[in-house]
Amino acid sequence: CEAPPTFEAMELIGKPKPYYRVGERVDYKCKKGYFYIPPLATHTICDRNHTWLPVSDEGCYREMCPHIRDPLNGEAILANGSYEFGAELHFICNEGYYLIGKDILYCELKDTVAIWSGKPPLCEKILCTPPPKIKNGKHTFSEVEVFEYLDAVTYSCDPAPGPDPFSLIGESMIYCGNNSTWSHAAPECKVVKCRFPVVENGKQISGFGKKFYYKATVMFECDKGYYLNGSDKIVCESNSTWDPPVPKCLKVSTSPTTKSPTSSASGPRPTYKPPVSNYPGYPKPDEGILNNLDD
């Protein structure tokens, strides 16, 4: 027989020879990191037809790391289903808890013993320090010193000393989240007031108000014979300015030589200004919808 078969889990005892006589026996032993569990044979014999009798390494089992229990308030998950060396053990914590330590341990071979690559981690409760205090405002549970996971606080603004109220800019409700951090930055309380939006040759059609505070929304329409240059809808933003800016109403010119400025309502820029009745958003001459302001 030629050289005996080689295996992943067991090795030949002694040096291999190039040829073996019929009837000659070779013995195997489990490799380092493996251990033998009977009854499977670990030897073979050179048969009369010059082949080796069947033998396998299935009696050699990988060394195993000790079993690790799930951490308190968490879970240990075997990546490949066994504790044999080479295994990975992944740790996750239940919602509301965070991991202290390594989230993966590896089953490694030290000499002939399989051991884990480190200590199992712990799952600690997620806690947050109190959220920031804000100027001109306050939050609920201001007396609480430690917040647990998903505990929420709601911010509100103080009454303003002047005629205009404070607006709350940002998220009014924030909660204690992962990494022991709050879900959002603390909001801001400040007076946000946009100027009265004046549009020459046009008028406001919605969003009427005494004053225009944060997030106030106004819509416009141009007089007959004028078209809107800009957006028909504007919003009062946190820096007390309108966004987009207050639009303009420009005169519709019937001259075929002049180009029309872009309008928020139009598609591609036309090469001339069409008559009013054909301009996007304008009525036909017999439709008097723009003649009355609040009809």
């Epitope: 946009c194 100027r195 009265f196 004046v198 020459e200 008028k203 009427f208 009355n292 609040d294």
Partner: antibody
Framework: EVQLVESGGGLVQPGGSLRLSCAAS????????ISWIRQSPSRGLEWLGV???????NYNSAFMSRFTISRDDSKNTAYLQMNSLKTEDTAVYYC????????????WGQGTLVTVSS | AIQLTQSPSSLSASVGDRVTITCRAL??????LNWYQQKPGKAPKLLIY???SLHSGVPSRFSGSGSGTEFTLTISSLQPDDFATYYC?????????FGQGTKVEIK
């Protein structure tokens, strides 16, 4: 509190020009939106135009071709330039500080009389 | 321009009377209407803005109401200091315009 004082009124012939001044004391004219309003027995109160803090202007289209509003921040003064004056322009002219960016006329000057007559 | 018409043009009343002045707009102006008081030889003074909001320092006997095209200024109990001319003013659309005025005289 800002005080507005108009000056420059007087007698002027039809077709003539006049420049009215509105001086601000106790505050910067550039910090306020300034409107010009006139009043006559025959025509009542008429809003002429406004100059906003950013220097932009809006006019009553009835006067746009003849009247111009401007501002000189170094002199802390707003102006109303009136050209091609007519007898019907005879009135008391007021400058007025617009209330906090809103068209509410809360802070008026004492007014200056302009008489257009030959 | 949006035309404002005040009624009556003048009225006579006594101290303690309840006085109502009306301002009508030819087009709807939402609540964008102000009221002013003017005494002879003086500049007008803002009384009420945005239909019903009292300007600072204005006595509470003055009140405003209305919406759209019809507005009223009410003086609940006329005082000697209230004999003056009253004007309404719209600001929904340029040019901003005034009513012709209502003169309140002593009866």
């Amino acid at each position: 509190e800002v005080q507005l004082v108009e000056s420059g009124g007087g007698l002027v012939q039809p077709g003539g020009s006049l420049r009215l001044s509105c001086a601000a004391s106790g505050g910067s004219v550039s910090s306020y939106d300034i409107s010009w309003i006139r009043q006559s027995p025959s025509r009542g109160l008429e809003w002429l135009g406004v100059i906003w803090t950013d220097g932009g202007t809006n006019y009553n289209s009835a006067f746009m071709s003849r009247f111009t509003i401007s501002r000189d921040d170094s002199k802390n003064t707003a102006y109303l330039q009136m050209n091609s004056l007519k007898t019907e322009d005879t009135a008391v002219y007021y400058c007025e500080r617009v209330y906090d960016g809103y068209p509410w006329f809360a802070y008026w000057g004492q007014g200056t009389l302009v008489t257009v007559s030959s | 321009a949006i035309q404002l018409t005040q009624s009556p043009s003048s009225l006579s009343a006594s101290v303690g009377d309840r006085v109502t002045i009306t301002c009508r707009a030819l087009q709807g102006i939402s609540n964008y209407l102000n009221w002013y008081q003017q005494k002879p030889g003086k500049a007008p003074k803002l009384l009420i803005y945005y239909t019903s909001s009292l300007h600072s320092g204005v006595p509470s006997r003055f009140s405003g109401s209305g919406s759209g095209t019809e507005f009223t200024l009410t003086i609940s109990s006329l005082q000697p200091d209230d004999f003056a001319t009253y004007y309404c003013q719209q600001y929904i659309k340029l040019p901003w315009t005034f009513g012709q005025g209502t003169k309140v005289e002593i009866k």
